[in-house]
């Protein structure tokens, strides 16, 4: 896997350990927590990033509260099981043998059960909404300029193909970015919208995952775009399965 040869680091993932022990003395980087080799020319999967995050100290866990509506990611931190490709395993369990099914972005999509719970397949999250509220500004941003800047950001910083940014909506102070990527649309080598959304979320929170890069400095026509609230919603290709008891709680 490629990495910066001179100092052997991973530009796209600072939560790695790198050493020149690859073929021909090439730099090879492994994700913290899992020890899996990562491709430093693209984004690392969210599963491996969460695992790395949980391997670091002082991590508090909060719960994702599911519902019959679009799933909301409330930064539900847990130590996930990842498959050999770095994707979330469909079934996740904790140390007390409580298990649940997740979607491709790792958000719970069923009631919790025991070890007998079956999750037949990893259900793909094909539509993501990033809902932002920006801090007060002298005036509203120009919608076209804002749209262009956010599309540029996802293309250049996160390497997400422009066709996967479905829409950018703006009604001051709310910005909504829609990412859409069906299974059939995603070609080999394409960045996953779930990974791009996770990198963006961490950037917005001032917790950039990129190695050595400055934090995210979002500007629209020179005017800083400062985000004060972020919510991320997920729609799966197959609706989640929660009991009616859970839905009315």
């Amino acid at each position: 896997h490629t990495a910066a040869q001179d100092n052997c680091t991973c530009p796209t993932n600072k939560m790695t350990v790198c050493s020149p022990d690859g073929p021909g003395g090439r730099c090879q980087c492994r994700a913290l927590g899992s020890g899996m080799a990562v491709d430093c020319s693209t984004l690392t999967s969210k599963c491996l990033l969460l695992k790395a995050r949980m391997s670091a100290p002082k991590n508090a866990r909060t719960l994702v509260r599911p519902s019959e509506h679009a799933l909301v990611d409330n930064d539900g931190l847990y130590d996930p099981d990842c498959d050999p490709e770095g994707r979330f395993k469909a079934r996740q369990c904790n140390q007390t043998s409580v298990c649940w099914c997740v979607n491709s972005v790792g958000v719970r999509r069923t009631d919790k059960g025991d070890l007998s719970l079956r999750c037949d397949e990893l259900v793909r999250t094909h539509h993501i909404l990033i809902d932002l509220r920006h801090r007060p500004t002298a005036g509203a941003f120009n919608h076209s300029d804002l749209d262009a800047e956010l599309r540029r950001l996802f293309r250049e910083r996160y390497r997400l193909h422009p066709k996967f940014v479905a829409a950018v909506h703006y009604e001051q102070p709310t910005i909504q970015i829609e990412l859409r990527q069906n299974t059939s649309q995603k070609a080999a080598g394409d960045v996953d919208i779930g990974d791009a959304a996770y990198y963006f979320e961490r950037d917005i929170k001032g917790e950039s995952l990129f190695q050595g890069r400055g934090g995210l400095d979002l500007r629209v026509r020179g005017e800083p775009l400062q985000v004060e609230r972020t919510l991320i919603y997920y729609l799966d290709e197959i609706p989640p399965k929660f009991s009616m008891k859970r839905l009315t709680a």
């Epitope: 679009a70 539509h127 009604e171 609706p239």
Partner: nanobody
Framework: QVQLQESGGGLVQPGGSLRLSCAAS????????MAWYRQAPGKQRDMVAT???????NYADSVKGRFTTSRDNAKNTVYLQMNSLKPEDTAVYVC???????????WGQGTQVTVSS
């Protein structure tokens, strides 16, 4: 600019049918729970039907079995099919869009439905 535009209202005889439409723009429609409310003169606004992002529906007891709501995410439109209409269904029908957790709550202007012989 966020917009919800209802259409399809009108005058219909008891026992007749109408199909209301609500065209949405300016927001991420697919993620929003959509609802139909109605308000009769001198009365409060009541929920008629709701449909979640995944298409799960819920109805007021007074319209169960007669009204059906559906959505077309490709067209950013939600529908209310109203059958076996009664005079007491006369009201202004208003479309609502709600994004749970985000406090985004948008309303249309409404369309008048009058059931009378």
């Amino acid at each position: 600019q966020v917009q919800l535009q209802e259409s399809g209202g009108g005058l219909v005889q008891p026992g007749g049918s109408l199909r209301l439409s609500c065209a949405a723009s300016g927001f991420a429609f697919s993620f929003y729970a959509m609802a139909w409310y109605r308000q009769a003169p001198g009365k409060q606004r009541d929920m008629v039907a709701t449909i979640t992002a995944y298409g799960n529906t819920n109805y007021a007891d007074s319209v169960k079995g007669r009204f059906t709501t559906s959505r077309d995410n490709a067209k950013n439109t939600v529908y209310l099919q109203m059958n076996s209409l009664k005079p007491e269904d006369t009201a202004v029908y208003v479309c609502n869009a709600n994004l749970p957790s985000a406090s985004h709550n948008y309303w249309g202007q409404g369309t008048q439905v009058t059931v009378s012989s």
